[in-house]
Interface confidence: medium
Amino acid sequence: CKAMHVAQPAVVLASSRGIASFVCEYASPGKATEVRVTVLRQADSQVTEVCAATYMMGNELTFLDDSICTGTSSGNQVNLTIQGLRAMDTGLYICKVELMYPPPYYLGIGNGTQIYVIDPEPCPDSDF
């Protein structure tokens, strides 16, 4: 494979509903038709897979039914949305792109997007 550049924003703030969206853009050196995108979370030097999807260029990304991720693709850009985030999920989310077909295989790993999640303050009980 050849190295492939992957760009993603440095910082994203999740919404009060625990939803964070960011764009993962890759500089495709080849004419890929099959692409695999993986979101990795790095925290305390531990790297875990958050979600992954394989898609055909021009088609929708298909994550597993129980995945916390959704996404759309447009050209060499993938718009990723991660849901159900809580404060404890704050961390560096890395976009990994693999051009699976046709050969040769290309791999690109972004520098990561720091996602900050702030749990909403509970509404105070009100006495009327």
Epitope: K2, A3, T33, E34, P104
Partner: antibody
Framework: QVQLQQSGTEVKKPGASVKVSCKAS????????FTWVRQAPGQGLEWMGW????????DYAQKFEGRVTMTTDTSTTTAYMELRGLKSDDTAMYYC????????WGQGTTVTVSS | QSVLTQPPSVSGAPGQRVTISCTGS?????????VHWYQQLPGTAPKLLIY???SRPSGVPDRFSGSKSGTSASLAISGLQSEDEADYYC???????????FGSGTKVTVL
């Protein structure tokens, strides 16, 4: 854990065909394709080709084009490699490996071609 | 004759550092394609050792390191151990053959 389990030893006559299977487990089958590699006795590794288990696209080494067919069966999470018109120099260990990056390998299937 | 040339054998005493070269051309390594390394212990299937020139999969000791420059690549094993006795193969894409090509293989012997 991720595993690739290949079918057993095959002994074939020249001109015959062989079909080697590779049963995958421990990961999402359609997320990775399969690479097939062979190794003749006492020789090095030889890349035969690759198949996507996402949509069945294939890419074969020119040497095997027209003689090899790679397929996958999503229902059984199994990949297959069929080689036709066997010759004595097809005698080798045949390996399947996960994805084009070949990060996990099967144990190998010995194919002997002899009259 | 392999498109990627490796020395047939290298040897070293336990604890020593050995280097295996993989020499290609402008249609493979020199064209910018990554080099991957595989270790094949006697009687077993190959195992991915280094991918993308210098990255190690989890579980591979940091005694193994890879590098690439120009039309060649190399694999270094530092602190050689008896369990490192194996055959080592490099792999890269060749755009003129339109196929992946393995190196000729190098047998590492621990003296």
């Amino acid at each position: 854990q991720v595993q690739l389990q290949q079918s057993g030893t095959e002994v074939k006559k020249p001109g015959a065909s062989v079909k080697v299977s590779c049963k995958a487990s421990g990961y999402i089958f359609t997320s990775y394709g399969f690479t097939w590699v062979r190794q003749a006795p006492g020789q090095g590794l030889e890349w035969m080709g690759w198949i996507s288990s996402y949509n069945g696209n294939t890419d074969y080494a020119q040497k095997f084009e027209g003689r090899v067919t790679m397929t996958t069966d999503t229902s059984t999470t199994t990949a297959y490699m069929e080689l036709r018109g066997l010759k004595s120099d097809d005698t080798a260990m045949y390996y399947c490996a996960r994805g084009p990056q070949m990060d996990v390998w099967g144990q190998g299937t010995t194919v002997t071609v002899s009259s | 004759q392999s498109v990627l040339t490796q020395p047939p054998s290298v040897s070293g005493a336990p604890g020593q550092r050995v280097t295996i070269s993989c020499t290609g051309s402008s249609s493979n390594i020199g064209a910018g394609y990554d080099v991957h390394w595989y270790q094949q212990l006697p009687g077993t299937a190959p195992k991915l050792l280094i991918y993308g020139n210098s990255s190690r999969p989890s579980g591979v000791p940091d005694r193994f390191s890879g590098s690439k420059s120009g039309t060649s690549a190399s694999l270094a094993i530092s602190g050689l151990q008896s369990e490192d006795e194996a055959d080592y193969y490099c792999l890269s894409w060749d755009e003129s053959l339109n196929a992946y090509v393995f190196g000729s293989g190098t047998k590492v012997t621990v003296l």
